[in-house]
């Protein structure tokens, strides 16, 4: 009988130890969750406040509506220009409307005057189609004014208030474009 009682007591003690362990694990887990929650909240607050404080466009970029534009200060061939823009999370300028064209040409007049600037327009040498790099065709009013006589690959550029075409391997300034950050949170 005494042996039975001591066995039961030992089993109860074992159960108690297991429950204490479980409670300890639960407390640890709860603490860990609370810490994670604090971290997440802090992260969210930091993200929100930095988004709140940051301007819609990076330094040295110009904003118009929901776009940011960067006018390069170096010359490069068309392909290198696009690679430079892509590195900045942008692409060579894709002109969607006459309003956008007017804004760009107006801004260029103020900044630099009458130079050549590559945009994201290239001509397929076989079909003769002009294409923006997303694959869309320019609207009829935004087709390059002169067809280049070059046997090489032909790309589009802006000069003054015109869209023109040239051998893609010639050196020009370029204009990058990306979406502006939404400033309202």
């Amino acid at each position: 009988k005494l042996l039975q009682v001591s066995t039961i007591a030992m089993q109860q003690q074992e159960k108690l130890i297991q429950q204490e362990r479980a409670l300890l694990n639960f407390t640890e887990w709860k603490r860990s969750c609370a810490l994670q929650m604090k971290y997440c909240q802090a992260f969210m607050q930091n993200s929100l406040s930095s988004a709140h404080n940051s301007s819609p466009c990076p330094n040295n970029w110009i904003q118009n509506r929901e776009s940011c534009y960067y006018v390069s200060e170096i010359w490069s061939i068309w392909h290198t220009s696009q690679e430079n823009c892509l590195k900045e999370g942008s692409t060579l300028l894709q002109i969607e409307s006459k309003e956008e064209m007017d804004f760009i040409t107006g801004s260029l007049r103020k900044i630099k005057g009458s130079y050549d600037y590559w945009v994201g327009l290239s001509q397929d040498g076989h079909s003769g189609r002009w294409l923006w790099q997303d694959g869309s065709s320019p609207s009829p009013g935004l087709l390059p004014a002169e067809r280049s006589q070059s046997a090489n690959q032909v790309c589009g550029y802006v000069k003054s208030n015109s869209l023109l075409s040239s051998n893609c391997s010639t050196w020009k300034y370029f204009i990058c474009e990306k979406y502006a950050l939404r400033s309202s949170v």
Epitope: Q82, E83, C85, L131, Q133, D134, G135, Q153, C168
Partner: nanobody, 112 residues
Framework: QVQLVESGGGLVQPGGSLRLSCAAS????????MTWVRQAPGKGLEWVAH????????TYTDSVEGRFTISRDNAKNTLYLQMNNLKAEDTAVYYC?????RGQGTQVTVSS
Amino acid sequence: QVQLVESGGGLVQPGGSLRLSCAASGFTFSGYVMTWVRQAPGKGLEWVAHIGSGGGHATYTDSVEGRFTISRDNAKNTLYLQMNNLKAEDTAVYYCEFLGRRGQGTQVTVSS
């Protein structure tokens, strides 16, 4: 250095299918329009299809419209051309093209 490597060509019977691939390197693939062109025996280069940088605006030459599908996987830097219901007149060397640069091509022969 820009490199384009086409594969997937072969001999197929009329009405059959093939899927061509083009592995691209040396440039930011996801930032550019990509094109498939072909050269039939004794003929010049012919534009087949192109696709926009993000996979939209796929456009085809009339003779392959509805039979061929151009697609791309920017994560894999790979361009594809799915060719169904192939005809004898589709026999050609197929090239993928980026800014006038082409690979070595892959031969597609449609014959019974």
